[in-house]
Structure formats: C-alpha cells, structure tokens
Interface confidence: low
C-alpha cells in the first residue's frame, strides 16, 4: 500500500494548540468525509496517547497514523508502532517517552488507507497537552496551635507544575480552593480543633514549562482533626 504523506505548509496559527488541514478534493466522494479529530495527551511526559473517535466513521475503518516533528532534527515521518483499539478497530496510537519532544511542533496525520486522499494533519504543541499524575504522599504538619501545613509530592519536576488545593470541614457544604505554584506547599493559618478537615490536591503543567489546561486527577484525600462530629448534619452527604 502506497501511503501519501502530506507535509504541512502555508500559514498556520502558531498560537493554537493544534492546526488542522484536510486534503482538497475535486468531487464529492468518500474522500470528502471529514476524518475524526485526533486528541493527544502526554501523561507525565512518560507516554502519549493520541486518540480519535473510531465510531464516527460510516463503516468500521482501521485509520492509520503517522507523525513527525516540524522544523527539527526529528522531522522524519514515523509510522505508529503501537495502535490502540476500540472493538478491534484502531482508535489511537501510543508513543513512548523517547518519541516525545515537548518543545518541538508535533505533526500528526490521520489517513484512511483505502482512500489515500482522505487524510488530515494537525499540529500540536505538546507542552500544552501534558497531564501529570495525581499528587502523592500528602502530609500535614501542625505549625502552631491553629496553623496547618500541607505538603505533597509529584512524580514530575515540581517547577513545571501549579496546584489546586481544596479543603473543607465536615460542616461545610462546599470546598474552599486555593491555587499554589510549584512550591507544592500550603498553609492554613486558622484551624478549628473541633472540626475534621479534608484536603485534596491536583496539579497542572502550567505556566512555566507549558500552558496545559487539563488538571491531573485529584490526590487521595487526607484528613485532620476530630473524628467525632455526631451532630454534623452534612457528614454523610459529603462523603460522596
């Protein structure tokens, strides 16, 4: 099978996280059907999954994926070597760490092997698509009679991450949020010793090393304080 590879050219929106081009066609045919959009996420800069909605195809089709890096030493076209499948149809590609170059423009091309002219190319800024693992090892320290300090670890260089801390007592209807930058430390200056506090944290690859919008999963919660809030009407509702 001869596969035609489209190398992107012309003007591109360099501020966008991706740039989509489709092959022009002269007549209405299968080749005019748009290909599904490819979505890529880099997980903790350990591997990357680029996926598409295979069920959007009019009939089951094993779409193929190629990729390269624009204007770099890694601009050689690569075939996907590890496809992801959904109901035995290709629905994604997984790239390993050595194939990920965060600060070069990643070009990904999806193609219908039965219709070589039916192909779409996207340009992605991978540093904006990093999702870190959830924060780990949450610990609480009592700095004074009423002050708590929350610490945690991330399995990535801390400098690249910002964090969101949420906390609440068993009496609260909702979480209180606080943004924390890469120093991954948070202090709560006024703690009520009669209440039980719950803390959780999530992290994002932003803003020093990238501009990712997606947060990690929430950490496992950590608790502090009284376990006996028998009169608290919200206790059980908040466990969900």
């Amino acid at each position: 099978l001869n596969t035609t590879i489209l190398t992107p050219n012309g003007n591109e929106d360099t501020t966008a996280d991706f740039f989509l081009t489709t092959m022009p066609t002269d007549s209405l045919s299968v080749s005019t059907l748009p290909l599904p959009e490819v979505q890529c996420f880099v997980f903790n800069v350990e591997y990357m999954n680029c996926t598409w909605n295979s069920s959007s195809e009019p009939q089951p089709t094993n779409l193929t994926l190629h990729y390269w890096y624009k204007n770099s030493d890694n601009d050689k076209v690569q075939k996907c070597s590890h496809y992801l499948f959904s109901e035995e149809i290709t629905s994604g590609c997984q790239l390993q760490k050595k194939e990920i170059h965060l600060y070069q423009t990643f070009v990904v091309q999806l193609q219908d092997p039965r219709e070589p002219r039916r192909q779409a190319t996207q340009m992605l800024k991978l540093q904006n698509l990093v999702i870190p693992w959830a924060p780990e090892n949450l610990t609480l320290h009592k700095l004074s009679e009423s002050q708590l300090e929350l610490n945690w670890n991330n399995r990535f260089l801390n400098h690249c991450l910002e964090h969101l801390v949420q906390y609440r007592t068993d009496w609260d209807h909702s979480w209180t949020e606080q943004s924390v930058d890469y120093r991954h430390k948070f202090s709560l200056p006024s703690v009520d010793g009669q209440k039980r506090y719950t803390f959780r944290v999530r992290s994002r690859f932003n803003p020093l090393c990238g501009s990712a919008q997606h947060w990690s999963e929430w950490s496992h919660p950590i608790h502090w304080g009284s376990n006996t809030s028998k009169e608290n009407p919200f206790l059980f509702a908040l466990e969900a």
Partner: antibody
Framework: QVQLQQWGAGLLKPSETLSLTCAVY????????WSWIRQPPGKGLEWIGE???????NYNPSLKSRVTISVDTSKNQFSLKLSSVTAADTAVYYC???????????????WGQGTLVTVSS | DVVMTQSPLSLPVTLGQPASISCRSS???????????LDWYLQKPGQSPQLLIY???NRASGVPDRFSGSGSGTDFTLKISRVEAEDVGVYYC?????????FGQGTKVEIK
Amino acid sequence: QVQLQQWGAGLLKPSETLSLTCAVYGESFSGYYWSWIRQPPGKGLEWIGEINHSGSTNYNPSLKSRVTISVDTSKNQFSLKLSSVTAADTAVYYCARGPAGSSSSGYFDYWGQGTLVTVSS
Amino acid sequence: DVVMTQSPLSLPVTLGQPASISCRSSQSLVHSNGYNYLDWYLQKPGQSPQLLIYLGSNRASGVPDRFSGSGSGTDFTLKISRVEAEDVGVYYCLQGSHWPWTFGQGTKVEIK
C-alpha cells in the same frame, strides 16, 4: 558536596556571542533548575535565566531575545549563549543551582566561581 | 518586575555590635501559599554570593545563628546580632514570589 565549575571566553568584541558552560559535580541534574546570574562591575546581581534537565527554559524578559540556555545531561553541564553583546554586557557571570521545586531551601544555594566577561572593541 | 530596595546602601559597623539591613519590595511577597519568598545572600570580597536566609527567616545550612531574618509582605530585615570580621561584604535580598526573580541593589557592610 555540590560543586559548580564554569568556563568560557573572557574577552569579546561588540556584536559577538558570549558563550559560557557550567559543569555540575556531586549532584543529579533532575529535580532542580540551573540558573545564570550576572553582576556588572561594581553593581548588583541580575538573574538571566534557567534550565532544567529536560531542557525547559525560563528567561528574564529583559534579555530573552538574546539569551539561549542549553543543557547536556550526559555531561551534567549547562551553557549560556548571549548574542549581539555590547559593553553593557560586561559583567561577572555566575552559574547557580536553583530554584528547586521545593521551598525547603533558598533560590540559589550553590554558585559557580564566576567568569568575568569583558566586551570591548 | 518587582523592585527590591535595600537600605542603607553602605553600613559601617563596629566589631561585636549589632547591625541591621532593610529590604523593601514594590509588591507583597506573601505568596498564595502563605510563605514569603525572600532570600538573603552575602557576597564576601572576591567571592561568589552565598545563601544566608531563605523564606524570609530560615537560616541556610551552616549559617551562624548570629544571622536572623524577619518580616512579611513588603518589609524585611536582616539582623546580625554581633558583627564579626568575616561578615564584611555586600548583602543582597532576592524575591522569589513574582516572575522574574529580582535582587536588591546590595548593602555594603564594612568595619569602622
């Protein structure tokens, strides 16, 4: 014990490119940013920029258009290039460790010995 | 950029006497996580700077306890309880709460 040893050309002509390298001994590259800081003769300190082990850089906006910091993790080294130098770039240039991601220590806890770079026609 | 202003710029001191240096920032250095990202460095004559104090009031490893840091927000102070001969040099404050990191202009401490 962490040690930073730096070297590079000490005398440049205007419009040339300053090039310095800093080698790190006794410390893994990962987990820290590695910075360049300069000090014009008789003046204060100015932070230039930083790089981590994976090559991610942050630069002082006042110098960003002329600065490139790179890293060679296989040698535990990082380098500074400053293009189109003028007499105003004459300074002692320091490499330093930091900042770390954690707030358990100060921003720059280990420093190189400094390299005097003079720009003169 | 955050401007860091130190005073005095020159400080003649007597051995064994206390000394105090002020550092003011143009913006509050209290970070969203509650900490003041303010370091103090000493640059002895002919040497590279060395870290003395971090987070406003924490002594770095190996720093004598005659050095102390205090303050919060925009006003910070470095105190030397009893000046020794080896304390001469230029003292700099550095803020790490706002990008980019900026230093004060330095305070030169010398023996009278």
